[in-house]
């Protein structure tokens, strides 16, 4: 039988390259059993993680997977940085790995690439 511990599956050292001005949903996959935990997002600032209390969030259920979503509508240049989700479960605080948003400001780009072109840019 599966463990009923809450787990947060943000991939370690994951990055998302996104365009300023576009909408984006940052996903925190949350595994839980009976009672959905209280989940929050924070943004890393040095060694501290600043709670994002005034941002739009929502839950999404898809194919037996639960996601706690942080919405960017739209993405702004200062959204660049690293984020973490945290869950409170049975008086324990569970923290995810951090995930990084790399925001390209379209004003500084000579030509706006498509989302897929952005996503598949390759650094040797």
């Amino acid at each position: 039988k599966e463990s009923c511990d809450v787990q947060l599956y943000i991939k370690r050292q994951s990055e998302h390259s996104i365009l300023a001005g576009d909408p984006f949903e940052l996903e925190c996959p949350v595994k839980y059993c009976a009672n959905r935990p209280h989940v929050t997002w924070c943004k890393l600032n040095g060694t501290t993680c600043v709670k994002l209390e005034d941002r739009q969030t929502s839950w999404k259920e898809e194919k037996n997977i639960s996601f706690f979503i942080l919405h960017f509508e739209p993405v702004l240049p200062n959204d660049n940085g690293s984020y973490r989700c945290s869950a409170n479960f049975q008086s324990n605080l569970i923290e995810s790995h951090s995930t990084t948003l790399r925001v390209t400001d379209v004003k500084s780009a000579s030509e706006r690439p498509s989302k897929d072109e952005m996503a598949s840019r390759f650094w040797a």
Epitope: R12, S17, I18, I65, I94, S120
Partner: antibody
Framework: EVQLQESGPSLVKPSQTLSLTCSVT????????WNWIRKFPGNKLEYMGY???????YFNPSLKSRISITRNTSKNQYYLQLNSVTTEDTATYYC????????????WGHGTTLTVSS | DIVLTQSPASLAVSLGQRATISCRAS??????????MHWYQQKAGQPPKLLIY???NLESGIPARFSGSGSRTDFTLTINPVEADDVATYYC?????????FGGGTKLEIK
């Protein structure tokens, strides 16, 4: 049901570029993580890299200077490109989906066998 | 990279007996508060098939003869009882850290 199907050449000459396609049905490549793996003739499995739901990519450092993974969301396909192939790249290439809850590979393609030879 | 060492490399077991395959990791597999170690079966000419995920969870449709256990650096796949259809190569895989890595495989044969 989720199904993945690899397609591409079975023979490539040394120094050429290998291009493979993974066509996905039953799920959208804008969710989860989509991977490439290869199996060498000696049965060793090597993880090559992924493209994520957002389009971000990760490449195995052993291949990083030669590999690229891209996608076409409207076709629900993702692609592997491997440059400057050698006979050491002779292998069976698989595409596979990672599950969100732990990244294990729950669905695989049947694989496509590549021989690198002049 | 995390190195996964599987043992034995090959195994011959009588029908109805127990087969035990070990996978030892060069680093602890627990950074998610969970053991991201998985087991696959691969038969000749087929892709790998998921058997066990996150160390001990049986994939849907897989017979309960297969079980997984272990934590941190030492993991085990057990098949009990072994059937003729189990002839295959078995691989462990870790997804705790990039790059994901696989064990070298264990070839199971019937004695």
């Amino acid at each position: 049901e989720v199904q993945l199907q690899e397609s591409g050449p079975s023979l490539v000459k040394p120094s050429q570029t290998l291009s493979l396609t993974c066509s996905v049905t039953g799920d959208s490549i804008t969710s989860a993580y989509w991977n490439w793996i290869r199996k060498f003739p000696g049965n060793k499995l090597e993880y090559m890299g992924y493209i994520s739901y957002s389009g971000s990519t990760y490449f195995n450092p052993s291949l990083k200077s030669r590999i690229s993974i891209t996608r076409n969301t409207s076709k629900n396909q993702y692609y592997l490109q491997l440059n400057s192939v050698t006979t050491e790249d002779t292998a069976t290439y698989y595409c596979a989906r990672s599950h969100y809850y732990g990244y294990y590979f729950d669905y695989w393609g049947h694989g496509t066998t590549l021989t690198v030879s002049s | 990279d995390i190195v996964l060492t599987q043992s034995p490399a090959s195994l011959a077991v009588s029908l109805g007996q127990r087969a035990t395959i070990s996978c030892r990791a060069s680093e602890t597999i627990d950074s998610y508060g969970d053991s991201l170690m998985h087991w696959y079966q691969q038969k000749a000419g087929q892709p790998p098939k998921l058997l066990i995920y996150r160390a001990s969870n049986l994939e849907s449709g897989i017979p309960a003869r297969f079980s997984g256990s272990g934590s941190r650096t030492d993991f085990t796949l057990t098949i009990n009882p072994v059937e003729a259809d189990d002839v295959a190569t078995y691989y462990c895989q870790q997804t705790d850290e990039d790059p994901y890595t696989f064990g070298g495989g264990t070839k199971l044969e019937i004695k």
